[in-house]
């Protein structure tokens, strides 16, 4: 039976259905609805969030809704003794405080439970000392103060602005420098746009604002008290101690009117270059310590935060294929937020909410999809990406065997500029080929489509009339089903122009101010990006769900293959001489590459030809697409990273956020010239390459033909 | 409009207690912070005190600190001042003020920009 | 003491101008924003002008701030009869940890 037989409706027909049930003005309403009071994970508030989803979509017309629920480890300021800091005198007053919550934006002056600015997962502590300013905290930054202006961290206090890289990062490199406690805060050259007001008048930041956030380091390991297993009732659960990614040292956020007080009297050495400094009317000077007149005073830290382990709920919706119902498309995003979630997560809650409404419109209707999909809203994704790898770890032999495609949902804006997409090489063409369908909400782009727009405001680097398309890092819910599962995924959001705007993601990220008054009178006031969003995540489901073969172009991973493989190689050989001397070579890793794109190549040819009313066929053309990801798995992970083993792609080790290619190779040579060992150290990039190129010659051997 | 009133002057006997209320309105008095300053009869204006929105850094003169305690309630959009061991020098008009925001920095560091009309305090035996 | 000095009074001819000295230290206009209050007779202290030069709305381009080292000043151009009040300078103390007002300098309108 094709597809169509199973429907009923021409798929052409479908599709246009789906996207012309998708309305601006329901995305608005849920928006609204969703934003009016916190969703902190592990709250009542979110409980009764995700109740009411269930019933919603139950409501819409999804076969079946469930709450899976898990109990993980969470972690709360504590109520009667707020986190701040102080600066303290020789007598050990305090002389200074920080602000003990962020000032309330209009008509929400009386919410209660608005947890009050933290760094999750921090541990306890008063720890007093001198201040070092870091810069952003990256590796790089730490060997800059280290190496070039050999500045001892040991024992002090770092303070470190917010951007450019994840903060649990951040936390690591503090920690790996010997620090024993860290700042965080924003910088107005980081969170302040030029030219626009500060919330409420306008999208930035005020002084009094500050981001939320985790600062673990899991690896991809979810819930930190069981590391690759269910955190369920009869879950065995690691001590504290030997809890995964906790942090070591007291971790605080503050705003910039805040760090104002502390930077303004920094002293020791100047900043290195002006890539150290920031926008505020301060000298920028690293330290250690306070400057002439206040050189006897300190910082101190009180930190009383608590780890507990907390149920939380994620809301697991289905809607089951006619033809193939144990393929699995997922369209998953997140419900938990810092505060009311604005943006994040619920602009994109929002878009997932209509997505499942037009399907269940058409399900009414006496459509089904030919694949099964699975809709989720996932719980503590703000505490470490919890609630989805939770449900994965659970559901882990279903979804390897079952496992299409995973589309993320989380904010679908993060300014209104132009489309952003990051997703496997094996949906480019899907991506490509839909935008090319849907009409651009761009001013200045009337009629034209969004493909069009897109690669207007955004051209590849490499290829031209082509859009770019980056890789998948992490920091978000795809994480597990990709980076540990091997499941093809992608994710799509409007962004801002990168190229004016080099603050890092949106000003009021993760404060109290964002809101919903944010989105409806600063970022999208009639919700045309969100509804173009909205027809970006839901057209790559529908297609995902409803073609007849898997919209994947293996020939796609062919091409990124070598050009990964050529930087890696060109990395490599900056040490020509260490390369000679350790015999290293790229040869193998070329030689698969060469037969991943031949055999790519020759399955493409038969997949235009093969006899499509053949279901067996069908199918088994279907699997080799579907499992293609799957073979870049490496079932024993990266060095020290056992859950994140994907051989192409890994979040790269610097920062979370960011997608590194060839992670095994790129590890092993980062700072290869300082290491102690260096025939040992060569050992391990030949090492890699092999697994390497072993990994893309066998994934190479998924596509040939089976006999 | 924005409003400020004091309230909870007058006269009181030296060692004795006192305390000030001022009631706010016509702006979103958890979001600002305030201050207390006093003039003597005759004489110029002191500043007394200052409490930051969330109560996490108070500041007083010299000539108060240890006796003087400045506080808010912010569901009652209502500053304090709570005077105890009163002197004569204390004897004055206090006022109450908003404190001035300037985007550079808390409020609370760059003075004020709105004023009550002021409560008589006079410490006399 | 006022730890910010003013002269303790100013006068001129109504169209004239006047200009009012605040000195201080590093630790108060050195390092933070000077403000300006007038005080008209029997009333509330009014802000005249706010970091180191700026206005509120509704107080005359007449009235002007100006800052330099540890020292400011506040001009008055155009004297009126209605400007007839005493002015004070105030800024941030660092040392201190408070605010400090000047001596105070009553304008009078000859």
């Known amino acids: 039976k094709s597809s169509n037989e199973a429907t009923n409706i021409t798929p052409k027909h479908n599709m246009k259905a789906f996207l012309d049930e998708l309305k601006a003005e329901n995305i608005k309403k849920f928006l609204y609805n969703f934003t009016q009071i916190p969703h902190l994970a592990g709250t009542e508030q979110n409980f009764q969030l995700a109740k009411q989803i269930q019933s919603q979509w139950k409501e819409f017309g999804l076969d079946s809704v469930e709450l899976a629920h898990y109990d993980v480890l969470l972690s709360y300021p504590n109520k009667t003794h707020p986190n701040y800091i102080s600066i303290i005198n020789e007598d050990g007053n305090e002389i200074f405080n920080t602000s003990l919550f962020e000032p309330p934006p209009p008509g929400y002056e009386n919410v209660s439970d608005i947890v009050p600015p933290f760094s999750a997962f921090s541990p306890q502590g008063m720890p007093e000392g001198d201040l070092v300013y870091v810069n952003y905290a990256r590796t790089e930054d730490f060997f800059k103060l280290e190496r070039d202006m050999k500045i001892n961290c040991s024992g002090k206090i770092v303070i470190a602005r917010y951007g450019k890289v994840f903060r649990g990062n951040k936390v690591k490199n503090a920690q790996l420098a010997g620090a024993k406690g860290v700042i965080l805060y924003s910088d107005p050259a980081d969170y302040f746009a030029p030219g626009v007001k500060s919330y409420p008048d306008g999208w930035n930041l005020p002084g009094g604002g500050v981001q939320r956030g985790n600062i673990l380091n899991l690896n991809g390991a979810g819930d930190p008290l069981t590391p690759g297993y269910p955190a369920n009732e009869y879950a065995y659960r690691r001590g504290i101690a030997e809890a995964v990614g906790l942090p070591s040292i007291p971790v605080h956020p503050i705003g910039y009117y805040d760090a104002q007080k502390l930077l303004e009297k920094m002293g020791g050495s100047a900043p290195p270059d002006s890539s150290w400094r920031g926008s505020l009317k301060v000298p920028y000077n690293v330290g250690p310590g306070f400057t002439g007149n206040f050189s006897t005073q300190k910082v101190k830290m009180h930190i009383h935060s608590t780890n507990e382990v907390t149920r939380i709920y994620n809301v697991i919706g289905t809607l089951r294929g006619a033809v193939e119902p144990d393929r699995y498309v997922i369209l998953g995003g997140h419900r938990d937020s810092w505060v009311f979630g604005g943006i994040d997560p619920q602009s994109g809650a929002a878009v997932v909410h209509e997505i499942v409404r037009s399907f269940g419109t058409l399900k009414k209707e006496g459509w089904r999809p030919r694949r099964t999909i699975l809709f989720a809203s996932w719980d503590a994704e703000e505490f470490g990406l919890l609630g989805s790898t939770e449900w994965a770890e659970e559901n882990s032999r279903l979804l390897q065997e079952r496992g299409v495609a995973y589309i993320n949902a989380d904010s679908s804006i993060e300014g209104n500029y132009t489309l952003r997409v990051d997703c496997t090489p094996l949906m480019y063409s899907l991506v490509h080929n839909l935008t090319k369908e849907l009409k651009s909400p761009d001013e200045g782009f009337e009629g034209k489509s969004l493909y069009e727009s897109w690669t207007k405001k955004s051209p590849s680097p490499e290829f031209s009339g082509m859009p770019r398309i980056s890789k998948l890092g992490s920091g978000n819910d795809f994480e597990v089903f990709f980076q540990r599962l091997g499941i093809a995924s992608g994710r799509a959001r409007y962004t801002k122009n990168w190229e004016t705007n080099k603050f890092s993601g949106y000003p009021l990220y993760h404060s109290v101010y964002e809101t919903y008054e944010l989105v409806e009178k600063f970022y999208d006031p009639m919700f045309k990006y969100h509804l173009t969003v909205a027809q970006v995540r839901g057209g790559m489901v529908f297609e995902l769900a409803n073609s007849i073969v898997l919209p994947f172009d293996c020939r796609d991973y062919a091409v990124v293959l070598r050009k990964y493989a050529d930087k890696i190689y060109s990395i490599s050989m900056k040490h020509p001489q260490e390369m000679k001397t350790y015999s290293v070579s790229f040869d193998s890793l070329f030689s698969a590459v060469k037969n991943f794109t031949e055999i790519a190549s020759k399955f493409s040819e038969r997949l235009q030809d093969f006899d499509k009313s053949n279901p067996i066929v069908l199918r088994m053309m279907n699997d080799q697409l579907m499992f293609l990801e799957r073979a870049f798995i490496d079932p024993l992970g990266l060095p020290d990273r056992p859950f994140y083993r994907h051989v192409i792609y890994a979040p790269s080790s610097h920062n979370k956020y960011a997608g590194e290619s060839f992670p095994g190779i790129y590890d092993a040579l980062f700072d290869i010239e300082s290491k102690v060992d260096p025939s040992k150290a060569w050992g391990e990039v030949k090492r890699q390459i092999y697994v390497a190129a072993f990994t893309v010659q066998a994934a190479a051997e998924t596509l040939s033909e089976v006999a | 409009e924005v409003q400020l009133v004091e309230s909870g002057g007058g006269v009181v006997q030296p060692g004795r207690s006192l305390r000030l209320s001022c009631a706010a309105s016509?702006?979103?008095?958890?979001?600002?912070?305030m201050h207390w300053v006093r003039q003597a009869p005759g004489k110029g204006l002191e500043w007394v005190a200052v409490v930051s929105f969330d109560e996490s850094n108070k500041y007083y003169a010299d000539s108060v600190k240890g006796r003087f305690t400045i506080s808010r309630d912010n569901s009652k959009n209502t500053l304090y001042l709570q005077m105890n061991s009163l002197r004569a020098e204390d004897t004055a008009v206090y006022y109450c003020?908003?404190?001035?925001?300037?985007?550079?920095?808390?409020?609370?560091?760059?003075?004020?920009?709105?004023w009550g009309q002021g409560t008589t305090v006079t410490v006399s035996s | 003491q006022s730890v910010l000095t003013q002269p303790p009074s100013a006068s001129g001819t109504p169209g004239q101008g006047v200009t009012i000295s605040c000195s201080g230290s590093s630790s108060n206009i050195g390092s933070n924003t000077v403000n300006w209050f007038q005080q008209l007779p029997g009333t509330a202290p009014k802000l005249l002008i706010y970091?180191?030069?700026q206005r509120p709305s509704g107080v005359p381009d007449r009235f002007s701030g100006s800052k330099s080292g540890t020292s400011a000043s506040l001009a008055i151009s155009g004297l009126q009869s209605e400007d007839e009040a005493d002015y004070y300078c105030?800024?941030?103390?660092?040392?201190?940890?408070?605010?400090?007002f000047g001596t105070g300098t009553k304008v009078t309108v000859l």
């Open positions: 105030a800024a941030w103390d660092d040392s201190l940890n408070g605010y400090v």
């Open positions: 016509g702006f979103t008095f958890i979001t600002y912070g």
């Open positions: 003020a908003r404190a001035l925001r300037d985007g550079n920095n808390w409020d609370y560091f760059n003075g004020m920009d709105v």
């Open positions: 970091s180191d030069n």
